[in-house]
Amino acid sequence: GSTVPPMVNVTRSEASEGNITVTCRASSFYPRNIILTWRQDGVSLSHDTQQWGDVLPDGNGTYQTWVATRICRGEEQRFTCYMEHSGNHSTHPVPSGNSHHHHHHHH
């Protein structure tokens, strides 16, 4: 099939006091090969500080996956989710509050 770029969605949720969990979800993409990682100041976080979901079919002939990490509240500006898929890339910031979700298609 032809390339379908992912939709990328970054959310945040309260973790423990002083911390938040940020989750980056990529969905509706094809083929299944994708790089999805959290960066701090542009540098990829180590693997032991991130959790990844499996790359799974979403039922439409495309795939979905996610990556999450825990960060200190107040340091959100330092963190971005980096996505690379089929030769294209994008960077996604952490939204400023719980009610703000960012959805982006990338071509």
Epitope: G42, T49, R78, H89, S90
Partner: antibody, heavy 118, light 108 residues
Framework: EIQLVQSGAEVKKPGSSVKVSCKPS????????IYWVRQAPGQGLEWIGY????????IYNQQFKDRATLTVDKSTSTAYMELSSLRSEDTAVYYC???????????WGQGTLVTVSS | EIVLTQSPATLSLSPGERATLSCSAS???????LHWYQQKPGQAPRLLIY???NLASGIPARFSGSGSGTDFTLTISSLEPEDFAVYYC?????????FGQGTKVEIK
């Protein structure tokens, strides 16, 4: 091959501004942050700030946030650092660098000497 | 601000000798955020070791790094003529990003 090529040396008067350019090549310009660092003669390295070329986010060292301005021109894949209200203490070599996969500064420009003198 | 203090300021050694450079942080740093750079006169710094102990691409195995918490070490097992330079540690854990003041390794 990844390279970052900077603009040439500048001589400036106190109170004026300087704008240094940095043109990376060998990778996708918007995929990595561009950092700026300076080094006064015979001194150590001092971080000025960085810019994410994809989203345009800028993080400054507080010490420079009132005088430094970081920008990018995505159409030419060029990053810029402008420093205003120059004083003699700003005489230094200014470096651009690229954020790496596992470290803050993995490739560096050749440096631009800025001399501030009346 | 995390202050990195490097010692000694100058290390005078002969080719073939072992060099041990120290970097002490004012606050604890995760090993993922401590890096070393080498700078020769008239040149830009270059990445030597990332994340405390990992050799950057093209760096010979005589270089090694170790440490944790507030104390980190760069070791050159047997100095080659091209190793005489200034070495900087750098932390990326908290803003502002900071460098040590450098250790100059000079020929004795």
């Amino acid at each position: 091959e990844i390279q970052l090529v900077q603009s040439g040396a500048e001589v400036k008067k106190p109170g004026s501004s300087v704008k240094v350019s940095c043109k990376p090549s060998g990778y996708a310009f918007t995929s990595n942050n561009i950092y700026w660092v300076r080094q006064a003669p015979g001194q150590g390295l001092e971080w000025i700030g960085y810019i994410d070329p994809y989203i345009g986010r800028i993080i400054y060292n507080q010490q420079f946030k009132d005088r430094a301005t970081l920008t990018v021109d995505k159409s030419t894949s060029t990053a810029y650092m402008e420093l205003s209200s120059l004083r003699s203490e700003d005489t230094a070599v200014y470096y651009c660098s690229r954020s790496g996969e596992r470290s803050n500064f993995d490739y560096w420009g050749q440096g631009t000497l800025v001399t501030v003198s009346s | 601000e995390i202050v990195l203090t490097q010692s000694p300021a100058t290390l005078s050694l002969s080719p073939g000798e072992r060099a041990t450079l120290s970097c002490s942080a004012s606050s604890s740093i995760s090993s993922n955020y401590l890096h070393w750079y080498q700078q020769k006169p008239g040149q830009a710094p270059r990445l030597l070791i990332y994340r405390t102990s990992n050799l950057a691409s093209g760096i010979p195995a005589r270089f090694s790094g170790s440490g944790s918490g507030t104390d980190f070490t760069l070791t050159i097992s047997s100095l080659e003529p091209e190793d005489f330079a200034v070495y900087y540690c750098q932390q990326g854990g908290s803003l502002p990003l900071t460098f040590g003041q450098g250790t100059k390794v000079e020929i004795k």
